[in-house]
Structures are given as structure tokens and as C-alpha cells.
């Protein structure tokens, strides 16, 4: 079970010359309402035939009065969706009729008068649970824009609303042979109830109440092996092992009919009965037109009504193929640059950028240092999507705002004592060592491994090298 939902976006004059006159006037104000009728399959039944899938009527729209001399604009619409509940499986292919009705609100005796303003019809393929499909239909000089979808009502799920979901009995997993119900991962698929008596070994069902046979079995309950029915074959020599007639080669062997055509023998050869949209001796010629509703996933059909005419489907984001039948993994093309994370949201593609990058595809490398000041005379250094400050002597931290303790790293070697100084640090070297960091030993004879200390400084005195 589920609901077919129809959203009317606009009803107004179509493009091109010959705009229709407004259906309402100052003398006869009116309001619109819509009726939708659904039938299963790609039927071409008359508009009057029953709406086997269901029908719905919208609320009345706002009252509209034409402005004299103005062209007919898009007319005000009723609020909300038209909803058509369906009790059984969603058929996947369906026919629709959408009627636009005018309710005249003049001073008619006996209440308002209704008249049919426009009727559009079409045949479409649609999977339940899919995205909203958008459509544009013309009726004379009028144009109707609308969206539609089919959704399952819990506990039903799946493209036909035939799989059932039940809350899990055990917290961790589903029972044997039963899958979790995506997207309701906390629920489990319930087993289908097939036709009573359907062979559990040789039969199965995809919809409640049916019994479909595995290969090699036949009969209403799949209890009859096919080998016994081959004894009834009218052709071929008798087989000594089974006592059955083994069919000889016939013109339909291997089914010469393409595209799902069914083959029947004729006195001289064979004949293919082609499915809708195909023709030719072997059903090899596609005569699909937009009237056959060939577009999936909300694709919009473009093409002529003539069987020779080409057609194609204008696909919504996330789908491709002549019939929009293929879902695109758009992230597999790695559209996000500079290590950005790709997110396919269905209706759009988003890139989540790493720090330091921006743009729809993370293609812009931000100037890491732009607007980033390093304090106290530090200079900004760019790199890898982040900024770093190279700080002046005596300062540290991310932005050089912290006064550094130059002695924290114990820079004076060989037991030298460190003194912080406004311009850096000073090392007072232990006896026998010299240099800015007390790194050089003084030779015992008084000679140094480096040039002697500047005049006026004895080895062991604090030395300051600026």
C-alpha cells in the first residue's frame, strides 16, 4: 500500500502565440480545482474508463478576478498536494489524467457552475520511493507544470511497495533469510505470504498471494515437473529412456524475437508478437515515443509523436542514460580538488573543503596570511592551507603575542648560566669555555680554538654576542 502524490506548480498560458483568454472575469469571478485519475499500466483507455488505481480532487483555489485588458497570467492554485492512496502493489507503469476545472462564482441560480478548462494525459514509468518527477504538459494554449511521486506506507517498502517491514524481534539482527529494511535499518523484511499451497521448494512470490515457479516446474502451485508435460509435445521422435517425445528443432527455438517479443510458429515460419514500443519481423526496431513514458527517475521526455521520431530523456541531477535509468556516482569523478570531501546529495553535489581552501570545488587556495597579522614584528609564512608566524627574537606563540623566555630551552652549553636580556640572551660561561653559547673549550695554555676573546674580556666573563 502507498500514496501517489501530485503537486501542481503552475497553470497558465503556454509559450508561443495565441495566448488564451482568462477563464475568469470581473463579472464572473472564478477559482480553479484539479482532478487526477490514475490507471495501472501503459493503457490507452478512454478518459471515462474507471480510475482503477484511484482518483483525487484538490481543494478549491483562491478566487480570481481578471484585470481588464491584462493577458491571462498563471492562475492562483489550491494549496497542498493531491493524494491518491493505493491499496495493492504500485504497478511501476501507470497512466494519468489531470483535469483543470473552473468553478464560476457569479450569481448563477442554483449555486456555482463547473466547467472543464483543460485535460492532460500521459503514460509514465515510476518507481515507488524515488525522487519527485517533474513534468510539463500542454492542453491547447494552456500549460500545466507539476511534480509527482509514489511513496509506500509503512510497513510496505520497495519500488512496488510489496516488501513488508516489521520491527526486529532480536536487537542485533534479522531472522534467517531476511534482510534489514533500508532505510529503516532497525526493522526487518517480513516474509511474503504466497498463494496458499504454493510449493515451498519450487515456487516463490514477489507479491503477496502469487505463486511463481522455479525453472523446471509448472502448474498453479508449481508442483508439476516440466519433464512430464514435455511428453505432450506434438513433435519429434520418442525417447527410449523416458518414453516422452523430445522436441526436434523448430523455428521458435532460441526465441528469434528480440526485446521481449514472444514467438509463435506459423505453417511456413514464425511470427513475433512485439511488446509495446517495438516492431519489425523480430521486434528489432524500437518505435518508442514520448507517449510510452520511457523516462525513469523524473526524466523529462523530448521527442515527436511520429514512430520514426527520435526521443530522449532530459535527466535530473544524479541520473544519466538515454532513459535516465542509471544513477551517477558523481563523486567517483573526484570533482573536489585539494583533498576536499565529496558529498552527493542527489539534487546537488557539495564539496567540504579542507582548511585553507574554498569554492564550489575547493579550487581556490585561500591566502593563508590574508588578514593574519603576526604581532611584535613577526612575519607570516604560508603553507599547506595554514599560516605560521616566524617570530622576532624574544617572542613566540601562534601569533608572536607571547613573550618568549629565551633561557627556557637551556641554550648555554657546558654548565653556562643563562640571563634573559631585552635583545635576546646572554650566556655566562663556566671556566674553560667560551663563545656565544659557551660551546668552545679554552685551551690550557690560554690559547683558544677560536680567535681570542675581544680585548677587555677575560675568558669566563659573560659574553654577549648580538
Amino acid at each position: 500500500a502507498g500514496v501517489f502524490e501530485l503537486q501542481i506548480h503552475s497553470f497558465g498560458p503556454g509559450p508561443g502565440p495565441g495566448a488564451p483568454r482568462s477563464p475568469c472575469s470581473a463579472r464572473l469571478p472564478c477559482r480553479l480545482f484539479f482532478r487526477v485519475c490514475l490507471k495501472p499500466g501503459l493503457s490507452e483507455e478512454a478518459a471515462e474508463s474507471p480510475c482503477a488505481l484511484g482518483a483525487a480532487l484538490s481543494a478549491r483555489g483562491p478566487v480570481y478576478t481578471e484585470q481588464p485588458g491584462a493577458p491571462a497570467p498563471d492562475l492562483p492554485l489550491p494549496d497542498g498536494l493531491l493524494q491518491v492512496p493505493f491499496r495493492d502493489a504500485w504497478p511501476g507503469t501507470f497512466s494519468f489524467i489531470i483535469e483543470t476545472w473552473r468553478e464560476e462564482l457569479g450569481d448563477q441560480i442554483g449555486g456555482p457552475a463547473w466547467s472543464l478548462l483543460a485535460r492532460v494525459a500521459g503514460r509514465r514509468r515510476l518507481a515507488a520511493g524515488g525522487p519527485w518527477a517533474r513534468d510539463i504538459q500542454r492542453a491547447g494554449a494552456w500549460e500545466l507544470r507539476f511534480s509527482y511521486r509514489a511513496r509506500c506506507e509503512p510497513p510496505a517498502v520497495g519500488t512496488a511497495c510489496t516488501r513488508l517491514c516489521r520491527p526486529r524481534s532480536a536487537p542485533s539482527r534479522c531472522g534467517p533469510g531476511l534482510r534489514p529494511c533500508a532505510p529503516l535499518e532497525d526493522e526487518c523484511e517480513a516474509p511474503l505470504v504466497c498463494r496458499a499451497g504454493c510449493s515451498p521448494e519450487h515456487g516463490f512470490c514477489e507479491q503477496p498471494g502469487e505463486c511463481r515457479c522455479l525453472e523446471g516446474w509448472t502448474g498453479p502451485l508449481c508442483t508439476v515437473p516440466v519433464s512430464t508435460s514435455s511428453c505432450l509435445s506434438p513433435r519429434g521422435p520418442s525417447s527410449a529412456t523416458t518414453g516422452c517425445l523430445v522436441p526436434g528443432p523448430g523455428p521458435c527455438d532460441g526465441n528469434p524475437c528480440a526485446n521481449g517479443g514472444s514467438c509463435s510458429e506459423t505453417p511456413r515460419s514464425f511470427e513475433c508478437t512485439c511488446p509495446r514500443g517495438f516492431y519489425g519481423l523480430r521486434c528489432e526496431v524500437s518505435g518508442v515515443t514520448c507517449a510510452d513514458g520511457p523516462c525513469f527517475n523524473g526524466g523529462l521526455c523530448v521527442g515527436g509523436a511520429d514512430p520514426d521520431s527520435a526521443y530522449i530523456c532530459h535527466c535530473p541531477p544524479g541520473f544519466q542514460g538515454s532513459n535516465c535509468e542509471k544513477r551517477v556516482d558523481r563523486c567517483s569523478l573526484q570533482p573536489c580538488r585539494n583533498g576536499g570531501l565529496c558529498l552527493d546529495l542527489g539534487h546537488a553535489l557539495r564539496c567540504r573543503c579542507r582548511a585553507g581552501f574554498a569554492g564550489p570545488r575547493c579550487e581556490h587556495d585561500l591566502d593563508d596570511c590574508a588578514g593574519r597579522a603576526c604581532a611584535n614584528g613577526g612575519t607570516c609564512v604560508e603553507g599547506g592551507g595554514a599560516h605560521r608566524c616566524s617570530c622576532a627574537l624574544g617572542f613566540g606563540g601562534r601569533d608572536c603575542r607571547e613573550r618568549a623566555d629565551p633561557c627556557a630551552a637551556r641554550p648555554c652549553a657546558h654548565g653556562g648560566r643563562c640571563y634573559a636580556h631585552f635583545s635576546g640572551l646572554v650566556c655566562a660561561c663556566a671556566p674553560g669555555y667560551m663563545g656565544a653559547r659557551c660551546e668552545f673549550p679554552v685551551h690550557p695554555d690560554g690559547a683558544s680554538a677560536l680567535p681570542a676573546a675581544p680585548p677587555g674580556l677575560r675568558p669566563g666573563d659573560p659574553q654577549r654576542y648580538l
Epitope: V302, I312, H314, C315, P316, Q320, G321
Partner: nanobody, 114 residues
């Protein structure tokens, strides 16, 4: 109102070739489904070649193998390469583009095959 500009039509001998071009200045064709319809005198318009917004192509049975539709996004132009032309290809060829919001037509270009 946006119109598409067709060019490349003309008179050609049977068996010859022509290349039609369809350009637009106010709209981008790369994200549209673009096709070529033709209309012979006294007949209805038939879509002979079409390229979708996701670059799938399709052709009318009568031109399959002879006509090729392609697009050049940099030039915002769609082409119809017509080879092995036959007298029955004589028609006015119209460029057509559409997306979910709107549709656009050209004025048409005449192709005559003698």
C-alpha cells in the same frame, strides 16, 4: 525572447554532406537537451537527432548511421553532421533546446537535396 540561431543549410546533391550549426548567445546549451527537428512540406515535425543534458544521443530510424549530433561547449554550439544525404531529407531543420524550466526554438534552416 531567446531564439537559437541555425546555419549551414543549403542545396546539396544526393549522396553529399552538410553540417548544420545551432548557436545561442543568451543561454548555455551544455546543460540543455538539444535536438534537430525537421519538417517537410505537408508533414509533421520529426525529431531526427537529439543530445541530452547528460550527453546521451538518439536518432530517428530514417537517419541512423548517416547523421551525427555533437556539441562544443566552449563554443556553445550544437552540430548536426549529415552524410549520404537523400532527396527525402529535404526539409526545414529546426534547432530545439529544453530543460526543466523552458524550451527554445530556432527559426529554421532549409536543406534541399537534389
Amino acid at each position: 525572447q531567446v531564439t537559437l540561431r541555425e546555419s549551414g543549410g543549403g542545396l546539396v546533391q544526393a549522396g553529399g554532406s552538410l553540417r548544420l550549426s545551432c548557436g545561442a548567445s543568451e543561454i548555455t546549451l551544455s546543460d540543455k537537451t538539444v535536438g534537430w527537428y525537421r519538417q517537410a512540406p505537408g508533414k509533421q515535425r520529426v525529431l531526427v537527432a537529439v543530445i541530452s543534458n547528460v550527453d546521451s544521443t538518439n536518432y530517428a530510424h530514417s537517419v541512423k548511421g548517416r547523421f551525427t549530433i555533437s556539441r562544443d561547449n566552449a563554443k556553445n554550439t550544437v552540430y548536426l553532421q549529415m552524410n549520404s544525404l537523400k532527396p527525402e531529407d529535404t526539409a526545414v531543420y529546426y534547432c530545439y533546446a529544453r530543460d526543466f524550466e523552458a524550451e527554445y526554438w530556432g527559426q529554421g534552416t532549409l536543406v534541399t537535396v537534389k
